[in-house]
Each structure stands twice: as C-alpha cells, then as structure tokens.
Interface confidence: low
C-alpha cells in the first residue's frame, strides 16, 4: 500500500499558487506524484509523475473555489488522493508592496507600488484585482517604539513638518477594507530628514 502525500497545503502569494506536500516514508523506493485540478467536473492533470513535492497552479482562475488533489505513486501502485479546496481571490497572501522614499528637507515623499501578479500582463498588479485596494503606512522615529499610521488616499503620500536631522522609518502593506484583509509589511525604509525650509531673518 502506497501512503498518501503528507502536509498538503497551498502556498499562494500574489496569485502565484504552489501546491506543496511532503513525501511520506516509503521503504520500497522513491515515490512520484501526480497533482490534478477539477475542471468542469473532470479532474485534469497538472503535474504528472513528478519527483518534486510541489506543483504550480498559478494558471487557475482567480475566482471561485478550486478542488485540487495529489497522490503518491510507486510502479503500478498509488495512494489515495488528498484533496484541498482553494479560492485564490480569498486565500492568496498579499505580498509586500514596493515603496520609493525621497527626502525633501523636513518632508518624506513616498510612492507605493502594488505587488505584481504572476502570469499576467507586465502592468497587472494586485490593485487591478481588488477594487477596494488601499495601503496602510506606518512610520516611526528610528530607535523609538511609537508607530504612527496612515491610510493614504492615493499611491503616494507626504509626511510634512517632521523633525529636522532625524531618521524616520516607513513601511507599507496592502489592505482590503471590504474583506478586512491585510497584506505583508514591506521591509522598513529609513531616511534622515534634513533642515526645515524656514530661512532665518
């Protein structure tokens, strides 16, 4: 009897949908695996007789529930199927946005870039999929614990009247208010302000 794949799960970030599993212990030899998806009531092969423990399902429609399954195989024997259900638009992880930060005197000017989507047009981003897409920004003085939060209305934001000659750190994430779903934070970007623009008399 061939044991089934273990710890079957979908690892999906920005609609790059990778079904992953672990190979069970099997004394007779090396196992191969077949992964399928349900399409119009018929299961279609996606990865056949692979020795890998993952299969890329990024071409699935972003909408609706998909039934995926995987089994282990050895010679003419095979395990039972292990099924999972996956809805990309609900289940994919929102990866960190990109961010450009520029210091102008005592202001920080930030521009946000929504994460790109795998297997789509080059210009296609998460913002194109989710109508309610917005950004959460948090910033803080470097070396302090108190963080301040903004929900920008656009793809850019300006923090004005900051303390001069002070290092501020900023990070951003995607947020979907209608789904109450937050993405992953970007790595903090830290920049030092310069002088304020007031000219002494």
């Amino acid at each position: 009897m061939v044991p089934p794949p273990e710890n079957v799960r979908m690892n999906s970030v920005n609609f790059k949908n990778i079904l992953q599993w672990e190979s069970p212990a099997f004394a007779k030899g090396n196992l191969t695996f077949t992964a399928q998806y349900l399409s119009y009531r018929i299961f279609q092969d996606k990865c056949m007789n692979t020795t890998l423990t993952e299969c890329d399902f990024s071409s699935l429609s972003k909408y609706g529930d998909h039934t995926l399954r995987v089994r282990a195989e050895f010679a003419d024997e095979h395990s039972d199927w292990v099924n999972i259900t996956f809805c990309p638009v609900d289940d994919t992880i929102i990866g960190p946005p990109g961010m450009q930060v520029e210091v102008l005197a005592d202001s920080l000017h930030m521009r946000f870039l929504a994460p790109k989507i795998e297997n789509e047009y080059e210009t296609w981003t998460m913002k194109n999929v989710y109508n309610s897409w917005t950004y959460n920004v948090q910033y803080w003085k470097n070396g302090t614990d108190e963080k301040f939060q903004i929900t920008p209305q656009y793809d850019f934001e300006v923090l004005r009247n900051l303390e001069p000659w002070t290092t501020y750190c900023v990070q951003v994430r995607g947020f979907l208010p209608d789904r109450n779903k937050a993405g992953e934070w970007s790595e903090p970007v830290c920049e030092q302000t310069t002088h304020d623009e007031t000219v002494p008399s």
Epitope: N136, Y139, E146, K147, F148, Q149, I150, T151, P152, Q153, Y154, E157, V158, L159, R160, F175, P177, N180, A182
Partner: nanobody
C-alpha cells in the same frame, strides 16, 4: 503616553442625534489614525468609524450599519475627534470608546483606549 477622554454620551430617543467627542493628549503626530469603537451589553467590541489625516486631506471609514447616519471628523488643532450620530436606533445602544491606530474596524485591534461613554437609545 497617549490619553483619550470621551464625552457626549447620554439617553436619546430613537431617531434622535448625539455628538460624541474624544479629546486626545500625548499625541506627537497628526497623522495617526483614530476612531470609535462600541460595545453593546453582552456583546463584543466592534469598530464604528476610523479617520486618518494624510498630507492631502482626510480619509474616513465606516462599518456598514452606521454609514450614512454617523459622521466622524477631527480637529487636529484641538486634538479632538468627533462622532456625529444621527437617526439613532435602539441597536446603537452601547458604550462608545475612542481608540488610536484603528486599522481594522471589524476587529478591535487598536493601541490606546479611552474609558468610554454610554449611549442609550430608548423611548
């Protein structure tokens, strides 16, 4: 240390109006999000409205059950946030709390809380 003090609660008839105020002290940034949560008797705390000042204006966010009836506003010069509540209903009866850093209205994950002000809607 941020301190929040709510006021303006009371007893009002269905269809009536109230204006809640939240006075904040200890802020070092006008950009912090700040908003209102509420907790009805025997229920969990829920978000009501959240407001964020940005470099170009104000972004306000409401839960569906109050949208169109409640209006959140803020006066940064006074470090005060207001909740204008119109067309009040019995189901709006709750203790209303002011809180900072209100990312998500549907989960009360905020950083600093006031002591609350009671709003009772009853005939």
């Amino acid at each position: 240390e941020v301190q929040l003090v709510e006021s303006g609660g009371g007893l009002v008839q269905p269809g009536g109006s109230l204006r809640l105020s939240c006075s904040a002290s200890g802020f070092t940034s006008p950009y912090s999000t700040i908003g209102w949560f509420r907790q009805a008797p025997g229920k969990g705390r829920e978000g009501v409205a959240c407001i964020s000042s940005s470099g170009r204006g104000v972004n306000a966010n409401y839960i569906d059950s109050v949208r169109g009836r409640f209006t959140i506003s803020r006066d940064n010069s006074k470090n005060t946030v207001y909740l204008q509540m119109n067309s009040l209903r019995a189901e709006d009866t709750a203790v209303y709390y002011c809180a900072t850093n209100c990312w998500r209205l549907t989960s009360p994950a905020a950083d600093n809380w006031g002591q609350g002000t009671m709003v009772t809607v009853s005939s």
